[in-house]
Interface confidence: medium
Amino acid sequence: NFMYSKTVKRLSKLREYQQYHPSLTCVMEGKDIEDWSCCPTPWTSFQSSCYFISTGMQSWTKSQKNCSVMGADLVVINTREEQDFIIQNLKRNSSYFLGLSDPGGRRHWQWVDQTPYNENVTFWHSGEPNNLDERCAIINFRSSEEWGWNDIHCHVPQKSICKMKKIYI
């Protein structure tokens, strides 16, 4: 009976996500058969989050809207380990919007999910950010420094990275 009600709950939860994510890839968390964590197929997973590389070229605002339609946000990078995971799925000749912007052009950077901006956990390329009229952040590859962040104009179409919390069922 307990197993039956658990299954019913899982099915109703899966139905919630079906609209945006017709297919989920789930893995068993730990040793308990009851706990599964899922990411939409073909998103990738790292720790408690799912990631999607959007290859369509759009402005920052449109990229964020595109992520939000999928129940996600443009990516917020919290650690070096997280960035190291993300870059494994990126192409060196492309740039990708992050969920980081400076709307007022006063170098008050802010993350889309209101995570406090911490100067100590940023990965700007050397000399960046350097253009006051460029108020959105991308991650890109520079041969001298590998992967890092750069400020660019928010209207310039780029690829993007979406991030959402894992779905637990």
Epitope: T61, G105, G127, H153, C154
Partner: antibody, heavy 122, light 111 residues
Framework: EVKLVESGGGLVKSGGSLKLSCEVS????????ISWVRQTPEKRLEWVAY????????YYPDSVKGRFTISRDNARNTLYLQMSSLRSEDTAMYYC???????????????WGQGTSVTVSS | DIVLTQSPASLAVSLGQRATISCKAS??????????LHWFQQKPGQPPKLLIY???NLESGIPARFSGSGSGTDFTLNIHPVEEEDAATYYC?????????FGGGTKLEIK
């Protein structure tokens, strides 16, 4: 007084190259994004290239991508446009133009030079 | 690319009357509540001069007889009362989508 002065235009054969310059004065060049915009003989205006204030970001329309390169020397207050593999459709008056100093308004040019004429003959 | 269609291609207006120029975009030029549509004036032998940015903001030094309105895809430049020195070609430009594009121009003649 804000001034932008273009030079380097002229007559060039199809497939040839040309380097345009734009010397600026009257404002802090290194703080402003600059674009090249051209005007065809039919008076049609077409954006050609953009370079960020720091010189690290450059953008081009498909019509010139791979053929034109925009660059700047902030120490010399000078903007450049290197044009190669020139075609007859590149014949135009080329203007350098300063962007409005508002990040919210993209590609809005508030001051323009007098232009330099480029003619590509076949 | 966003196509901007200006109309009329040319118009003649009597001194002191109103000149109205229309600019229609092939898709919305709204970006986060800002209308990224701008107006320029160009006189023969001169470069374009910015008159109005973001649909309705008058650039500094431009006389108040110039005004802009509109949103989404339909925009208008009004000049009232028209003066002799307003004889020129007027262009609209959008900056919402890369690449930025310009309208074909409207030539204003003063009668």
């Amino acid at each position: 007084e804000v001034k932008l002065v273009e030079s380097g235009g002229g007559l060039v054969k199809s497939g040839g190259s040309l380097k345009l310059s734009c010397e600026v004065s009257g404002f802090t060049f290194s703080s402003y994004t600059i674009s090249w915009v051209r005007q065809t003989p039919e008076k049609r205006l077409e954006w050609v290239a953009y370079i960020s204030s720091g010189g690290d970001n450059a953008y081009y329309p498909d019509s010139v991508k791979g053929r034109f390169t925009i660059s700047r020397d902030n120490a010399r207050n000078t903007l450049y446009l290197q044009m190669s593999s020139l075609r007859s459709e590149d014949t135009a008056m080329y203007y350098c133009a300063r962007h409005l100093y508002y990040g919210d308004y993209f590609y809005v040019m508030d001051y323009w030079g007098q232009g330099t004429s480029v003619t590509v003959s076949s | 690319d966003i196509v901007l269609t200006q109309s009329p291609a040319s118009l003649a207006v009597s001194l002191g009357q109103r000149a109205t120029i229309s600019c229609k975009a092939s898709q919305s030029v709204d970006y986060d509540g800002d209308n990224c549509l701008h107006w320029f004036q160009q006189k023969p032998g001169q470069p374009p001069k910015l008159l109005i940015y973001a649909a309705s903001n008058l650039e500094s030094g431009i006389p108040a007889r110039f005004s802009g309105s509109g949103s989404g895809t339909d925009f208008t430049l009004n000049i009232h009362p028209v003066e002799e020195e307003d004889a020129a070609t007027y262009y609209c430009q959008q900056s919402n989508e890369d690449p930025p594009t310009f309208g074909g121009g409207t030539k204003l003649e003063i009668k």
